[in-house]
Interface confidence: low
Amino acid sequence: AQGKEVVLLDFAAAGGELGWLTHPYGKGWDLMQNIMNDMPIYMYSVCNVMSGDQDNWLRTNWVYRGEAERIFIELKFTVRDCNSFPGGASSCKETFNLYYAESDLDYGTNFQKRLFTKIDTIAPDEITVSSDFEARHVKLNVEERSVGPLTRKGFYLAFQDIGACVALLSVRVYYKKCPELLQGLAHFPETIAGSDAPSLATVAGTCVDHAVVPPGGEEPRMHCAVDGEWLVPIGQCLCQAGYEKVEDACQACSPGFFKFEASESPCLECPEHTLPSPEGATSCECEEGFFRAPQDPASMPCTRPPSAPHYLTAVGMGAKVELRWTPPQDSGGREDIVYSVTCEQCWPESGECGPCEASVRYSEPPHGLTRTSVTVSDLEPHMNYTFTVEARNGVSGLVTSRSFRTASVSINQTEPPKVRLEGRSTTSLSVSWSIPPPQQSRVWKYEVTYRKKGDSNSYNVRRTEGFSVTLDDLAPDTTYLVQVQALTQEGQGAGSKVHEFQTLSPEGSGNLAV
């Protein structure tokens, strides 16, 4: 922003009525009147070029400083060419001196040179030669000087002539202010420019109506330079929630629009599944049956919980069940769907039911699942299980209803035993097995069936209550097919897979563990 000038003294505008003091009185400087463009203009002039040793002073009236710290002095003047006078006027000069003096009171006609301090020698850029003067084409010079810092109540300026032919047409004294400014939705007051040449004064701004400093943001500040210009803007204000920037002001959002926080963005149209908003809305209310999760941005459409998983299957495999389902047909308008699986077991004899979370094992944690399948193991034989798969999204917690699908499965067999070869010799095989602990109480005995590989006509059976057996009287260096099956009071359980175990050859010795 351009600096603002506050004028303290304007000779040209005063119409010759300022009555400046000349010294020596009646000599040297003289107030003259001329007509220019049919208007009277006044000037102080002096032209004692032939006399030598001139010391003519012109002092302004006392000027009240007010709030000025640094003043600027603009002079408009003409200077005649010394060569345009007879013999070149050896004592002729083409410059004059500018002085100032500060004081707390007006000394009136009491003029003392010693109180004045020289500001500068004023030299013209262009001098008026004889031909110009005769044709009334005078060359007007403009020079500007500044003084500061000023501290007293007022000051005088003085012009010392040392033998030039000078006409002083304009003396304008002013100081500079950084003007009142609206920038970045902040108001900066009119500020007096400082006195130190490169100084910058920090000025705090005030946010306009309905504007605020954003959280963690910088307060608006500008720097007022000595020449009355603002620079180095810091920070800003933003229109508060419910308002948007229109030129240099904050205006309420129109009906059907909203703005949820202080930001540079404009008001946004209310999203889908919302009710029309009133003027100045910070958010748009959701339609009945639609919701906004706490973490949802206000610009996101309102959403609802999903429908149930579309299709659910439970496939039993011994004492395991694989659950598979497909995503809900209606996601509720969200992408953050997760699934939860719960389990209930029922005893066929009594029809009594209860939760079975503690006794079964899931292939992954059953809550917050993102995949659409899970395997449940460690199920007990001859038990009825009901599995529930619930679909949830970010707004499911805002309603009491649940979206789920169930599937039931009966476990009629124990899980197949897991069989290991513990040791072998030329004539024996030591075999062990295991089944999940929940099923062990239902097993009456284990049946071990074995036969030579390739011999389908005969096979041998051994029964035991334990978890291992040694099969004796076997042929050396021979492969046997071995299977273990649990026997329950209800009948046979699931058989293990058939294993191939080989006895040692006669060259080997001892009962070597595998």
Partner: antibody, heavy 115, light 107 residues
């Protein structure tokens, strides 16, 4: 006349801290914005930050924000630069300067960050 | 951030020559631009601010010009004491940035 005298430089290991001081005289310290500028060996000048006359506002370049802190004690005519988490690239002569556009400078103090 | 590109990086001149150093800003910086002189082993010295304003006490053979993005430091009738590094600075908004510097040698 305006005088600025920096101190507190020296050798410090990477990750270490250092506090530079600048003693001011010859002018009304409390009326002036003050700045720090550094110059790595054989390199250009780099602005390190500025603090307003009363210490209300501080400004930093992104390169040192969060690591360097400028403060001042107007009663002591002193300006400070607290430098934390120093890196090898912070090796430089550090100057304090009057004004935000550095009208007067001190002679500088050398900070060497090396293991 | 606004960058300043200073050129040339070095130059050699004879006493009495007229020397020109330029500084180009990557964006308009109005006239918030200054020039500094730095002699070996010394602190920098402000010569010119607001593109063309000479600091008190700086010889008037130094002058600055420019506006917007292009700025020039001119040294008329260069003297041997002017051998130094010269840096430009933009200061319209934080962060302030300096030019890379120009080394001026006297033959």
């Amino acid at each position: 006349q305006v005088q600025l005298l920096e101190s507190g430089g020296g050798l410090v290991q990477p990750g270490g801290s250092l506090r530079l001081s600048c003693a001011a005289s010859g002018f009304t310290f409390s009326s002036y914005t003050m700045s720090w500028v550094r110059q790595a060996p054989g390199q250009a000048l780099e602005w390190m930050g500025t603090i307003s006359s009363r210490g209300t506002y501080t400004y930093y370049p992104d390169s040192v924000k969060g690591r360097f802190t400028i403060s001042r004690d107007n009663a002591k005519n002193s300006l400070y630069l607290q430098m934390n988490s120093l890196r090898a690239e912070d090796t430089a002569v550090y100057y304090c300067a009057r004004e935000a556009i550095f009208t007067h400078w001190g002679r500088g103090t050398l900070v060497t960050v090396s293991s | 951030d606004i960058q300043l590109t200073q050129s040339p990086s070095s130059l050699s001149a004879s006493v009495g020559d007229r020397v020109t150093i330029t500084c180009k800003a990557s964006q308009d910086i109005n006239n918030y631009h200054s020039w500094y002189q730095q002699k070996p082993g010394q602190a920098p010295r402000l010569l010119i601010y607001r593109a063309n304003r000479l600091v008190d006490g700086v010889p008037d053979r130094f002058s600055g010009s420019g506006y917007g993005t292009d700025f020039t430091l001119t040294i008329n009738n260069i003297e041997s004491e002017d051998a130094a590094y010269y840096f430009c600075l933009k200061y319209n908004v934080f962060p302030y940035t300096f030019g890379q510097g120009t080394k001026v040698e006297i033959k």
